[in-house]
């Protein structure tokens, strides 16, 4: 009976032609980095760089590794036990309600508002009303509404006096 060896434990030269290691399920479940065989008697390792499983499972198939879209950078590659981690490129962000794509961050705040938060890979710039301090809804303003320090140049935080 073979030991529980996942493919990320193998030397890089061995990964080029992945061997699907087998072991026996424990109480009907297979460890992370594996899936269960059709007859339920074996645990089969996921294919390094192609698919993965993160938990003890009785899945028939490992899950496909995510491929980062254009406009994303790969923070960490897919292993047999962890999916790829992708992040939006600088100047773009991913919203919770539209996770399938990175959107461009706004370059400035609407008139009468001041920027209090920068563009990050997970959030747009944050704008608040100068007087009340309440947050802006996040709707992209029309070009002519954007506060600018000179025609066509978005204001930087320090150019707004508050």
């Amino acid at each position: 009976e073979s030991a529980l060896i996942t493919q990320q434990d193998l030397a890089p030269q061995q990964r080029a032609a992945p061997q699907q290691k087998r072991s026996s399920p424990s109480e009907g479940l297979c460890p992370p980095g594996h899936h269960i065989s059709e007859d339920g008697r074996d645990c089969i390792s996921c294919k390094y760089g192609q698919d993965y499983s993160t938990h003890w499972n009785d899945l028939l198939f490992c899950l496909r590794c995510t491929r980062c879209d254009s406009g994303e950078v790969e923070l960490s590659p897919c292993t047999t036990t962890r999916n790829t981690v992708c992040q939006c490129e600088e100047g773009t962000f991913r919203e919770e309600d539209s996770p399938e794509m990175c959107r461009k961050c706004r370059t400035g705040c609407p008139r009468g508002m001041v920027k209090v938060g920068d563009c990050t890979p997970w959030s747009d710039i944050e704008c608040v009303h100068k007087e009340s301090g309440t947050k802006h809804s996040g709707e992209v303003p029309a070009v002519e509404e954007t506060v600018t320090s000179s025609p066509g140049t978005p204001a930087s935080p320090c150019s707004l006096s508050g």
């Epitope: 899936h35 269960i36 059709e38 339920g40 192609q50 698919d51 499972n57 009785d58 899945l59 028939l60 198939f61 490992c62 899950l63 496909r64």
Partner: nanobody, 124 residues
């Protein structure tokens, strides 16, 4: 979002063959494992067969092993079920489903989508 549409069902004599198709819309077809389930009149849902995202790993229920063949064409976003040596007990509505994976018991893992079903009747 994935939308699934089955076709190919119909009336066939015992011993005959049918090929079911399941056309998927949406660019994420290749990210998902795919499967066929069936529901016979007055019975519960039965897990029939499944195939992984790349098409190189398959599963069959004992009741259809050796008679049914599951396959997928990722370039056409289509799943197939070739059914040979059909029996009266194969009569059912056949549904295709997609999920990140499936457990041995047929439980979908992660986000999953289902078609509307196609009726297969095996009768002389």
């Amino acid at each position: 979002e994935v939308q699934l549409l089955e076709s190919g069902g119909g009336l066939v004599q015992p011993g005959g063959s049918l090929r079911l198709s399941c056309a998927a819309s949406g660019r994420t077809f290749t990210n998902y494992a795919m499967s066929w389930f069936r529901q016979a009149p007055g019975k519960g849902l039965e897990f029939v067969s499944a195939i992984n995202w790349s098409g190189d790993s398959t599963y069959y229920a004992d009741s259809v092993k050796g008679r049914f063949t599951i396959s997928r064409d990722n370039s056409k976003n289509t799943l197939y079920l070739q059914m040979n040596s059909l029996r009266a007990e194969d009569t059912a509505v056949y549904y295709c489903a997609s999920a990140e994976s499936f457990s041995r018991g047929g439980l979908p893992y992660g986000m999953n989508y289902w078609g509307q079903g196609t009726l297969v009747t095996v009768s002389s």
